[in-house]
């Protein structure tokens, strides 16, 4: 049984909260798109599945999570959009062939501590930064 | 004539520099893909094109730039990949249907100063954060 698992939930889009721009928000520009809005998805990663079980002693895996979903106009408040992402969204609407939508990426990442063997077979406890996604946004 | 422009250059991928993982790098796993690796693209945004000329006095536009490109295995040193992105890349390869590749997003953003009319027609000079992409990475 594979121990890397993910759960998928749907989430409604709310209206857009803009800092940089006074933009009249289309009520639901991307209602035709079936992909949900940018959000955090749960993902448990097993170090065995990654083939790292021979050098990582503990933990056996961790809740890494990941970001996925659309960053479409209008960007709502939950999307933690940067000012640049708001501008890029509008430019994408005008020039979809040339400029992509902003992408759904981690906005907050946490560290985890890992106990592992180094190249000399010493047991090391090390904190690895930016391993766990805590929040996502449109960037 | 749209004054939002972008220039695209190709960029070679180098081998992957990993912090979190001891992973042997496939020499060119995604050579068949035509999209270039994650990088910054130049983009000039005209406020007139965005329809903001009536309230933004100056500047007339600015070099916003944007991020685009593949975040494929192996992630090279130029891609400023987080540890999470490295893990996600591997999970994507094992489960491409379920977990996307990391996305190419801004890693450094700069502010610009904008002179504009507020709702009461006062002239305001305000610094808008996170308006200009200075660097991109796989997140």
């Amino acid at each position: 049984s594979a121990s890397s698992r993910r759960r998928q939930q749907s989430r409604n889009r709310s209206t857009q909260s803009q800092d940089v721009a006074r933009v009249s928000s289309a009520s639901d520009y991307n209602s035709s798109e079936l992909k949900t809005a940018c959000r955090k998805h749960e993902l448990y990663v097993s170090f065995q599945d990654l083939g790292w079980q021979d050098w990582i002693i503990a933990p056996k895996g961790y809740a890494a999570n990941y970001c996925d979903g659309e960053c479409s106009f209008p960007l709502n408040a939950h999307m933690n959009a940067t000012n640049h992402a708001i501008v890029q969204t509008l430019v994408h609407l005008m020039n979809p062939e040339y400029v992509p939508k902003p992408c759904c990426a981690p906005t907050k990442l946490n560290a985890i501590s890992v106990l592992y063997f180094d190249d000399n077979s010493n047991v090391i406890l090390k904190k690895y930064r930016n391993m766990v996604v805590r929040a996502c946004g449109c960037h | 004539s749209a004054s939002s422009r972008r220039r695209q250059q190709s960029r070679n991928r180098s081998t992957q520099s990993q912090d979190v993982a001891r992973v042997s790098s496939a020499s060119d796993y995604n050579s068949s893909e035509l999209k270039t690796a994650c990088r910054k693209h130049e983009l000039y945004v005209s406020f007139q094109d965005l329809g903001w000329q009536d309230w933004i006095i100056a500047p007339k536009g600015y070099a916003a730039n944007y991020c685009d490109g593949e975040c494929s295995f192996p992630l090279n040193a130029h891609m400023n990949a987080t540890n999470h992105a490295i893990v996600q890349t591997l999970v994507h390869l094992m489960n491409p249907e379920y977990v996307p590749k990391p996305c190419c997003a801004p890693t450094k953003l700069n502010a610009i100063s904008v002179l504009y009319f507020d709702d009461n027609s006062n002239v305001i000079l305000k610094k808008y954060r996170n308006m200009v992409v200075r660097a991109c990475g796989c997140h």
């Epitope: 079936l34 996925d68 | 491409p96």
Partner: antibody, heavy 118, light 107 residues
């Protein structure tokens, strides 16, 4: 029980299109990716592409040069594979197969024979 | 694209024999390999996933080993119902690629 039931055999003319269906039952349709694999007579297995019914994400084998389209209907728990611009070399048995996260193709349809002949 | 090379393409064996089939990947795919059994006129059946994990309901005489680029499917004691064609499959990005198959025939 978990099963995938495919539509019946088809005979098609070169240049036409075929749409094969795959009805899933016994599990939550949107929780598993659906792949399509074909097998020409006496030949091996060739992966065509997949769909994730949850988000409609698709990926295709470039060998089919835009001729293949995979869709899914959540309301009927059915996946579809459409192949256009058919030629005689497309004569094959077409299979749908479920692939759970972290696993391989664990459940397969019975196969649909598509014969392309003038 | 990753290429999967199976050997031998066919073999003859007797009931009770130990049979070994190998699969080589053109790139390191770690443990991301599956084995399938296919009988004439039937759909493939999953035997092994993640290189070594036995699928539900598969007899313990089947086992998988290997990682990286070299993998092996072993049938410890061949049974009459095991005469079939066996395919390996690399699961490492897309396209998902199959080996050419190994036909196990009765000697």
């Amino acid at each position: 029980q978990v099963q995938l039931v495919q539509s019946g055999a088809e005979v098609k003319k070169p240049g036409s299109s075929v749409k094969v269906s795959c009805k899933a039952s016994g599990y939550t349709f949107t929780s598993y990716a659906m792949h399509w694999v074909r097998q020409a007579p006496g030949q091996g297995l060739e992966w065509m592409g997949y769909i994730n019914p949850y988000n409609r994400g698709t990926k295709y084998n470039e060998n089919f040069k835009g001729r293949v389209t995979i869709t899914a209907d959540e309301s009927t728990s059915t996946a579809y594979m459409e192949l256009s611009s058919l030629r005689s070399e497309d004569t094959a048995v077409y299979y749908c197969a479920r692939r759970p996260f972290g696993n391989a193709m664990d459940i397969w349809g019975q196969g649909t024979l598509v014969t392309v002949s003038s | 694209d990753i290429q999967m090379t199976q050997s031998p393409s066919s073999l003859s064996a007797s009931v009770g024999d130990r049979v070994t089939i190998t699969c080589r990947s053109s790139e390191n795919i770690y443990r991301n390999l599956a084995w399938y059994q296919q009988k004439p006129g039937k759909a493939p059946k999953l035997l092994i996933y993640a290189a070594t994990n036995l699928a539900d309901g598969v007899p313990s005489r089947f086992s998988g080993s290997g990682s990286g680029t070299d993998f092996t499917l072993t049938i410890s004691s061949l049974q009459p119902e095991d005469f079939a064609t066996y395919y390996c499959q690399g699961i490492w990005g897309t396209p998902l690629t199959f080996g050419g198959g190994t036909k196990v025939e009765i000697k």
